[in-house]
Amino acid sequence: DPVKPSRGPLVTCTCESPHCRGPTCQGAWCTVVLVREEGRHPQEHRGCGNLHRELCRGRPTEFVNHYCCDSHLCNRNVSLVLEATQTPSEQPGTDSQ
């Protein structure tokens, strides 16, 4: 992999997903992403964020919930829920604007 650009202070986060290279990762912030794909049980992934902080501000839907935090291992014990019902104005993958 190419050397990645420095982004200033990094935080250590819990990493739990199929793509984690170890139990922790380092990033600009920590993340928890809860995703429910069609016909499957929701899956919760923990990791690091470096790009597109705007996703942290997205409203939970019945398909996805993003959570972000900024301190050491702050994503370790966070548990997320999905919205129970989808309102007419919301769609899967709701735009984060």
Partner: antibody, heavy 118, light 108 residues
């Protein structure tokens, strides 16, 4: 080595919906490290960012196109797709897909020309 | 949205010369998320520089990037015939992502 390949109709009629798919090979679209983008380039002009999707299905669109754009992901097929509704001749362009991480947009698909004409 | 303005619009130089391309942002851009791309006719853009100054894999060391805040520069120290193309700067990492309008580097 990750490769991206755009596919879809090269000709779309005005007022219809443009639909393109980007197939990712050599890597997983489900990795949390990447964002999957669509970009277009009008003939002889510069690059215009359309929007991105994350593996979770969360999206962000260019405000100038937001009302007409939908980007979706199919992790089981390792694909993501673009739909642009109510097209006009001004939507004639080469459409590219690209992977984004903290090292920029790399790789890109080779691009596909979509012409809007009756 | 951050507007990126590239200058000059066209740059006419000879092989062996040094090229300096500028990209100015309408507001401060994190240097971690500033990239440069090269595009040749009929081809997709190719990543040259990311993080304002890091060369992408396989990019010759005659290409270098510098700058911070609102001003970024792409320098090609000694032009080769294959370097004549259009160059775009881009800010990414936060949305909406934007590109500069491009600088055309042509043979004098």
């Amino acid at each position: 080595q990750v490769q991206l390949q755009e596919s879809g109709p090269g000709l779309v009629k005005p007022s219809q919906t443009l639909s393109l798919t980007c197939t990712v090979s050599g890597g997983s679209i489900s990795s949390g490290d990447y964002y999957w983008n669509w970009i277009r380039q009008h003939p002889g002009k510069g690059l215009e960012w359309i929007g991105y999707i994350y593996y979770s299905g969360s999206t962000y669109y260019n405000p100038s196109l937001k009302s007409r754009v939908t980007i979706s992901v199919d992790t089981s097929k390792n694909q993501f797709s673009l739909k642009l509704s109510s097209v006009t001749a001004a939507d004639t362009a080469v459409y590219y897909c690209a992977r984004e991480d903290i090292a920029g947009f790399d790789p890109w698909g080779q691009g596909t020309l979509v012409t809007v004409s009756s | 949205e951050i507007v990126l303005t590239q200058s000059p619009g066209t740059l006419s130089l000879s092989p062996g010369e040094r090229a300096t391309l500028s990209c100015r942002a309408s507001q401060s851009v994190s240097s971690s998320y500033l990239a440069w791309y090269q595009q040749k006719p009929g081809q997709a853009p190719r990543l040259l520089i990311y993080g304002a100054s890091s060369r992408a894999t396989g990019i010759p060391d005659r290409f270098s990037g510098s700058g911070s805040g609102t001003d970024s520069t792409l320098t090609i120290s000694r032009l080769e015939p294959e370097d004549f193309a259009v160059y775009y700067c881009q800010q990414y990492g936060s949305s909406p992502i934007t590109f500069g309008q491009g600088t055309r580097l042509e043979i004098k």
